[in-house]
């Protein structure tokens, strides 16, 4: 589910194994499958589960990626 063409999935067990613009998660719908890969970070106003999912300069607040200099997503 990367936006970059010909992206080679990199297997991972935790976010620290991925690049600064990536996080570690299952690419399958519902996230039920066991295999995890490095996925492109989530931009502002996207759903998130944890800070590492959000792109640099953003963090996960109440399930939404928000800018680090903002208090809310709206």
């Amino acid at each position: 589910y990367q936006t970059i063409d010909n992206y080679q999935p990199y297997p991972c067990a935790e976010d620290e194994e991925c690049g600064t613009d990536e996080y570690c998660a299952s690419p399958t719908r519902g996230g039920d499958a066991g295999v995890q890969i490095c996925l492109a970070c989530r931009k502002r106003r996207k759903r998130c589960m944890r800070h590492a999912m959000c792109c640099p300069g953003n963090y996960c607040k109440n399930g939404i990626c928000v800018s680090s200099d903002q208090n809310h997503f709206r």
């Epitope: 589910y1 936006t3 719908r29 519902g30 996230g31 039920d32 931009k43 502002r44 106003r45 996207k46 759903r47 998130c48 589960m49 109440n62 399930g63 939404i64 997503f73």
Partner: antibody, heavy 119, light 107 residues
Framework: QVQLVQSGAEVKKPGASVKVSCKAS????????INWVRQATGQGLEWMGW????????GYAQKFQGRVTMTRNTSISTAFMELSSLRSEDTAVYYC????????????WGQGTTVTVSS | DIQMTQSPSSLSASVGDRVTITCQAS??????LNWYQQKPGKAPRLLIY???NLETGVPSRFSGSGSGTDFTFTISSLQPEDIATFYC?????????FGQGTRLEIK
């Protein structure tokens, strides 16, 4: 099988509140978001907001801020949507729908609950 | 917020025809677009996700394409059971937005 079953039709007076339930079965309730979408007769689909049943986090469309509350009871795998200060324009069919947190799509929908607001 | 504009708002076609519906986003949404079918009195049904991926169990005559701001939904050969209203929906970011719908009728 995977399904969402909603509560029955409601008739309410203007100014009242309505609480619609959505019971999930056939999958792990806390693994998917629940979204609420409404549709007035002959009109299009209108997104109201989302709820993460795992954390209880919610996000509401600006139009409904302050009037809508989305909650859940994980022990009975049920999501709830309460809309207050009802007016005639809130007369619609209200749907719950499942998505994962990537918003790949609302792949499972409830059957809909008709809410009629009339004096 | 992102606005989604669908066209046409309604169309009439014959069985076997190729039918095309377009959806335009007010800003770039990459491929974060879904298509739904809704038959009268029923809940919507997800047909296409991520702009071009066919949902499980959906007939292959349905397809989607596009990215950025312009998207297309196609029925390669219209069947009588396809009569419904079709909606696009963006999920690039919150708030979620649906197109106004395209009502499809049989000629």
């Amino acid at each position: 099988q995977v399904q969402l079953v909603q509560s029955g039709a409601e008739v309410k007076k203007p100014g009242a509140s309505v609480k619609v339930s959505c019971k999930a079965s056939g999958y792990t309730f806390t693994s998917y978001d629940i979204n609420w979408v409404r549709q007035a007769t002959g009109q299009g689909l209108e997104w109201m907001g989302w709820m993460d049943p795992n954390s209880g986090n919610t996000g509401y469309a600006q139009k409904f801020q302050g009037r809508v509350t989305m909650t859940r009871n994980t022990s009975i795998s049920t999501a709830f949507m309460e809309l207050s200060s009802l007016r005639s324009e809130d007369t619609a069919v209200y749907y719950c729908a499942r998505t994962d947190y990537f918003y790949f799509g609302m792949d499972v929908w409830g059957q809909g609950t008709t809410v009629t607001v009339s004096s | 917020d992102i606005q989604m504009t669908q066209s046409p708002s309604s169309l009439s076609a014959s069985v076997g025809d190729r039918v095309t519906i377009t959806c335009q986003a007010s800003q770039d949404i990459s491929k974060d677009l879904n298509w739904y079918q809704q038959k009268p009195g029923k809940a919507p049904r997800l047909l296409i996700y991520d702009a071009s991926n066919l949902e499980t169990g959906v007939p292959s005559r349905f397809s989607g394409s596009g990215s950025g701001t312009d998207f297309t939904f196609t029925i390669s050969s219209l069947q009588p059971e396809d009569i419904a209203t079709f909606y696009c929906q963006q999920y690039d970011h919150l708030p979620i937005a649906f197109g106004q719908g395209t009502r499809l009728e049989i000629k």
